[in-house]
């Protein structure tokens, strides 16, 4: 799996999980989240050569097409596969609220 | 939906379905498929600005992050959403075989 265990341990130009810390205020302009101040969102990036963790038959076809026709703009892309939620604390007036924001943290990637 | 009905009718720089015909022999080097000779595979491409058909909370966060930090390499990507199979005819020796290859045709796209 193109997850932290593999990707953070290897220097990998191909599609892999990359570390990304997001500060809610600075990076998103979000002032409403009280805690945490930010989180390890991570992101997916890198090349998608033929058979590199392809998601579907179409992405395999597309990566092969792209290898044989490198000038073409059609190619698969490295995107998130498994995601996890993030628990946040925010306030409505003086009332604290604890909620889970779904699909906020990328845990692994794929070529799609 | 970012499908043919919308994307093929509008000039769209943002994430959208793009037409792509793949000739099995010429474009993939596949000689084993007897019929069809090729097919309309289509592909997804285009920018993923904030809230443009975002797939998950993470892709929304990433597109907003990318808007505020345009120099960053972290950004969502335009990928396939709905896919359809393709029926093919091939031969093993003189025996004709008709099979469905799953997820071969892209019908719509999303930012992920």
């Amino acid at each position: 799996a193109l997850d932290a265990a593999y990707c953070f341990r290897n220097v990998q130009d191909n599609c892999c999980l990359r570390p990304l810390y997001i500060d809610f205020k600075r990076d998103l302009g979000w002032k409403w989240i009280h805690e945490p101040k930010g989180y390890n969102a991570n992101f997916c990036a890198g090349a998608c050569p033929y058979l590199w963790s392809s998601d579907t038959q179409h992405s395999r076809v597309l990566s092969l097409y792209n290898t044989i026709n490198p000038e073409a703009s059609a190619s698969p892309c490295c995107v998130s596969q498994d995601l996890e939620p993030l628990t946040i604390l925010y306030y409505i007036g003086k009332t604290p609220k604890i909620e889970q924001l779904s699909n906020m943290i990328v845990k692994s990637c794929k070529c799609s | 939906a970012l499908d043919a009905a919308y994307c093929f009718r509008n000039v769209q720089d943002n994430c959208c379905l793009r037409p792509l015909y793949i000739d099995f022999k010429r474009d993939l080097g596949w000689k084993w498929i007897h019929e069809p000779k090729g097919y309309n595979a289509n592909f997804c491409a285009g920018a993923c600005p904030y809230l443009w058909s975002s797939d998950t909370q993470h892709s929304r966060v990433l597109s907003l992050y990318n808007t505020i930090n345009p120099e960053a390499s972290a950004s969502p990507c335009c990928v396939s959403q709905d896919l359809e199979p393709l029926t093919i005819l091939y031969y093993i020796g003189k025996t004709p075989k008709i099979e469905q290859l799953s997820n071969m045709i892209v019908k719509s796209c999303k930012c992920s």
């Epitope: 058979l51 092969l64 044989i68 | 080097g29 084993w32 093919i88 091939y90 099979e99 290859l101």
Partner: antibody, heavy 122, light 109 residues
């Protein structure tokens, strides 16, 4: 890291059998054919057959039909090749190699094992 | 069964172009893969589906396939290219995979 790791070298007597293993890691084992290819000393590559780890289906080269058996254990992502009634001309390096599992085995062997030397000598 | 014929050896000076052929009846109707095998090592895929190059293989390696001959071309040959090269196809008629006999590439000097 995508890799195929094979079992160690073997020395066998003529008429005996040998079973070579090939452990896959770093990819979905059931998504690729596993082929076996051998190479006698100073000779070229010779395809022996394949197994579809998903179904257990096999296809053996005519030359090895009746002498070779390919099996797999999906729980440990391992393929096996057993060659029976060994002769001195079976002395060779035996490789496992994967190819993507389309409807036909037309894809290339993109990952190979390190090879297992099998010596048949009385 | 299907037969692939390669020249046993090809010699080339460093910096020049090496061409290794693989002959077969109507090979142009089949997908050809090429492998490089250095002494004492497992083969490595260098070209697949006639002309696709795996990532990590230098652009100096290219190939073509038409009619009865497939050709692997290595431009600006280096000492490190010295190896045995094998062509391979899947023969749909017999459902067998077939290798050529191999070509030993020698880099002179």
């Amino acid at each position: 890291q995508v890799q195929l790791v094979q079992s160690g070298a073997e020395v066998k007597k003529p008429g005996a059998s040998v079973k070579v293993s090939c452990k896959a890691s770093g990819y979905t084992f059931t998504g690729y054919y596993m082929h076996w290819v051998r190479q006698a000393p100073g000779q070229g590559l010779e395809w022996m057959g394949w197994i579809n780890p998903n179904t257990g289906g096999t296809n053996y080269a005519q030359k090895f039909q009746g002498r070779v058996t390919m099996t797999r254990d999906t729980s440990i992502s391992t393929a096996y090749m057993e060659l029976s009634r060994l002769r001195s001309d079976d002395t060779a390096v035996y490789y496992c190699a994967r190819s993507f599992l389309w409807l036909v085995p037309s894809d290339a062997f993109d990952i190979w094992g390190q090879g297992t030397m099998v010596t048949v000598s009385s | 069964s299907y037969v692939l014929t390669q020249p046993p050896s090809v010699s080339v000076a460093p910096g020049k172009t090496a061409r290794i052929t693989c002959g077969g009846n109507n090979i142009g109707f089949r997908s050809v893969h090429w492998y490089q095998q250095k002494s004492g090592q497992a083969p490595v895929l260098v070209i697949y589906f006639d002309r696709a190059r795996p990532s990590g293989i230098p652009e100096r390696f290219s190939a073509s396939n038409s009619e009865n001959t497939a050709t692997l071309t290595i431009r600006r040959v280096e000492a490190g290219d010295e190896a045995d090269y094998y062509c391979q196809v899947w023969d749909s008629d017999s459902d067998d995979l077939v290798f050529g006999g191999g070509t030993q590439l020698t880099v002179l000097g």
